[in-house]
Amino acid sequence: TRDIREPPALKYGIVLDAGSSHTSMFIYKWPADKENDTGIVGQHSSCDVPGGGISSYADNPSGAGQSLVGCLEQALRDVPKERHAGTPLYLGATAGMRLLNLTNPEASTSVLTAVTHTLTQYPFDFRGARILSGQEEGVFGWVTANYLLENFIKYGWVGRWFRPRKGTLGAMDLGGASTQITFETTSPAEDRASEVQLRLYGQHYRVYTHSFLCYGRDQVLQRLLASALQTHSFHPCWPRGFSTHVLLGDVYQSPCTVAQRPQTFNSSARVSLSGSSDPHLCRDLVSGLFSFSSCPFSRCSFNGVFQPPVAGNFIAFSAFFYTVNFLRTSMGLPVATLQQLEAAAVNVCNQTWAQLQARVPGQQAHLADYCAGAMFVQQLLSRGYGFDERAFGGVIFQKKAADTAVGWALGYMLNLTNLIPADPPGLRKGTDFS
């Protein structure tokens, strides 16, 4: 008889990414005997929760919990039953809940309580539901990208762990309600709040991170809409031939539009607004989102926020990817340089509604917003973060790495389950022939 080698036992972990516009569930898996290896944890499956983000259930907290049931049922299927009890389950909420917590902390608590109530009903090892800080969201996204791309440590053929020569990758995340930029830097931080020191696999990393609340794609679109209502009788970023009725209550209920909110307005009033396909006015409208007037540090990105010069290569994911991918794939426009990105944004903003629909059939939902989205991404990267043509050449727009979605969720789980040791693995792997 010969021994049949059984496949290594797998462990699983579940993270619910409760974003501002929707919630996604990610199930991760890894071989139980290789927990400390880098890049060994991968995505097993995922599930999109139907409906809006949990912050949209402020008036109906129970619904926030119940909305997760379908995906949790999928988790019961996707994770082998004998692993359920040992599978950690986390829920992390981001900027949508940060905003709700600012405006209505009681509702925010009620939503998290309801979600917790639902998650504790399941046989997984539930380890809490909480709101991540912007700093955590940025850093965990950076950890995810670099972990998946195996930038922290590498396993050499001689059986020794070594740190690869290539540096780490910066991470840029564009969510629904906030955007994050995170990268390794040698410059000491002039603002302590933006510096995070990490020790991973025995290596020390000094990381700059900042999260801009209200600069996520959905909130930017709301702010531009509020500005258009305030300054124009039309929306320069919407295509000509497109018009819709805007409910004022929807526009002004967000704390992000408070600056444009009239002193008195009828929240139930509907205002008709039409697009005008005006790239130049649209650019002006988007420019109004950034302030460069004062900087209390030696250098800033925008709004008086300290930022060292961008350094190294970057991965831009989530809505950065979706926006650029639309320009590249749906519109067939080149976006390899900043100049091309700007030209692509202008191209989209010049299109009429009929032209856009003909060009991109069957994508009605957000079609009218791609002009504003493209203008914002272009301005955020060039004027906001200070990418020049050379630095922009080092930016890759990608939503996945190693078949795993890039975002804060994996980094969060790796951190909370101690899957990234602070010190390098003590045991040698394999044989040293030297």
């Epitope: 129970s62 619904g63 119940q66 049931v69 019961l76 299927r77 109530h117 639902t118 504790t120 009903q121």
Partner: antibody, heavy 120, light 109 residues
Amino acid sequence: QVQLVQSGAEVKKPGSSVKVSCKASGGTFDSYAVSWVRQAPGQGLEWMGRIVPWLGHTQYAQKFQGRVTITADESTSTAYMELSSLRSEDTAVYYCARESPGYRYSFDVWDQGTLVTVSS
Amino acid sequence: SYELTQPLSVSVALGQTARITCSGDAIGEKYVYWYQQKPGQAPVLVIYDDNNRPSGIPERFSGSNSGNTATLTISRAQAGDEADYYCASYDLQQARWVFGGGTKLTVLG
């Protein structure tokens, strides 16, 4: 402690419909779903369908699809089960049962049931 | 469609151990729940998640589940345990609850 209270016994003619109510007393349907289970005389339990009251989300057993409608009125914490095109084999005790969102505690609160008799 | 099969009846001597089985295709991969129903009464949950007891259910009741068979075990059976017992499982594929046909437990002596 939440209790479920159902409407009284009904006698119906074949081909007609019956609507049974189930009210949560001492609490609401907050974070719970409500299932309807029936039991014909001397027979076993048979699941008919469920509703998540605050979402209005329903699921039905294939056998009853198109003949059963489950609704809920959140304001009164009452769930309803309506069964149409009644036939004699629908004579049964109809139970409403509360289930937690994750099925972890399955049906933890039941009412005593409503007897529906279908007879010409 | 998924089905659960139970023996029609099981007898046990007073004070002895009763075992009621519930078989279904790969039932060990699903969670099984057990209900006790006495004549003229609504069912009562006695076991959830294969082997967990809700508060108020005596320790004499236990459950196990693997392979194609789930088992409800009642040790030191008492006259008051005489009832119909139903196993149930949630069929995730079809999003529906499935009940076994029920087992009548008779306590002799």
